[in-house]
Interface confidence: low
């Protein structure tokens, strides 16, 4: 087993101290939260302009509508991140023109084109998970060591849609090493 340090799990993307997973399947907003929790992460909470630019680019490049961890479900018009922090007033510059418009109970935020849009939370979209990168100071899953042959299955009753995450964690280390330098 090689002891090369890699700060993120396989098929996660590293950016400024955090790891991001861009899903390849689609879920509604609430199930996207669950998907991220099941891999020890959180539906993405954006904390800096640099992070926003990075994530917006990922989303627009792939031309995907992608959930972020932001909604006004608790109180109409009061946007809040899934970690409980409020949407700062200056974030509003990232909404697409005319958004959020709350047409037909649109209470969850997505990356859409070059900005943000509010949409119905029950719609299936791609999602982005975020968690802190490993420090590489101790032996963790993030080291480039062979993956277990079979990852733990999702908890009973959690439904499908996590295959892309779990499959990602089955990639053999040498394939990963070949593709990630």
């Amino acid at each position: 087993t090689e002891r090369l340090c890699h700060p993120c799990p396989w098929e996660w993307t590293f950016f400024q101290g955090n790891c991001y997973f861009m899903s390849n399947s689609q879920r509604n907003w609430h199930d996207s939260i669950t998907a991220c929790k099941e891999v020890g992460a959180q539906l993405v909470v954006i904390k800096s302009a640099e992070e926003q630019n990075f994530l917006q680019l990922q989303s627009s490049r792939s031309n995907r509508f992608t959930w972020m961890g932001l909604s006004d479900l608790n109180q109409e018009g009061t946007w809040q991140w899934v970690d409980g922090s409020p949407l700062l007033p200056s974030f509003k510059q990232y909404w697409n023109r005319g958004e959020p418009n709350n047409v037909g109970e649109e209470d969850c935020a997505e990356f859409s084109g070059n900005g943000w849009n509010d949409d119905k939370c029950n719609l299936a979209k791609f999602w982005i998970c975020k968690k802190s990168a490993a420090s590489c100071s101790r032996d963790e899953e993030q080291f480039l060591s062979p993956a277990p042959a079979t990852p733990n299955p999702p908890p009973a009753g959690s439904g499908g849609g996590l295959n892309d995450i779990f499959e990602a964690q089955k990639i053999e280390w040498h394939e990963h090493h070949h593709h990630h330098h």
Epitope: I46, K47, S48, A49, Q52, D83, G84, S85, P86, L88, P89, S90, F91, K92, Q93
Partner: antibody
Framework: QVTLRESGPALVKPTQTLTLTCTFS??????????VTWIRQPPGKALEWLAL???????YYSTSLKTRLAISKDTSKNQVVLTMTNMDPVDTATYYC??????????????WGRGTLVTVSS | DIQMTQSPSTLSASVGDRVTITCRAS??????LAWYQQKPGKAPKLLIY???SLESGVPSRFSGSGSGTEFTLTISSLQPDDFATYYC????????FGQGTKVEIK
Amino acid sequence: QVTLRESGPALVKPTQTLTLTCTFSGFSLSTSGVSVTWIRQPPGKALEWLALIDWDDDKYYSTSLKTRLAISKDTSKNQVVLTMTNMDPVDTATYYCARTPSGSYGRYFDLWGRGTLVTVSS
Amino acid sequence: DIQMTQSPSTLSASVGDRVTITCRASQSISTWLAWYQQKPGKAPKLLIYEASSLESGVPSRFSGSGSGTEFTLTISSLQPDDFATYYCQQYNSYWTFGQGTKVEIK
């Protein structure tokens, strides 16, 4: 070069209304993400945030002073005006205007004016 | 409203000392915290934003850390120009300043 300059009366009488103007250059309050704020500091005391206005004319006021404050902007003149009604001697302070930079998620204040001292006395 | 409490209120130190100022928030503010330096008769100057990001032009001896409710400003080696009053400010929900910490010559 970005500058902000506060102007207004140095002395106001109790119960009067104070009007302060912040004139700025080097940036535009029509630029997305930019805002201008007012902060005051009584002699020898701490800073106190008063009000803020965004590029899109959204306004925010200190909870304890919101009934007395009004903030407005004139984008063409590069000015932000603060009015404070029913002035009292405890409102004696140096009043500063400051800017929130464009594109910053955090609403910190990166550039400040020199401040103008307002004394409330009869 | 979120309250910000700084400690100590006054700090006596010598040139070359490592100085640490603490700021506590009454509720979690994530990393939405700034530090300012103010000298007598002058406007405050931004040092640190987002808890740990150094403002352009600020000497690297200044650093910030913390998240949630506990934050620190550290001056690694105090210089003559650093004797001043320092304020923390939260911008998680509206804007609130701490009461200030005066760094004076020992």
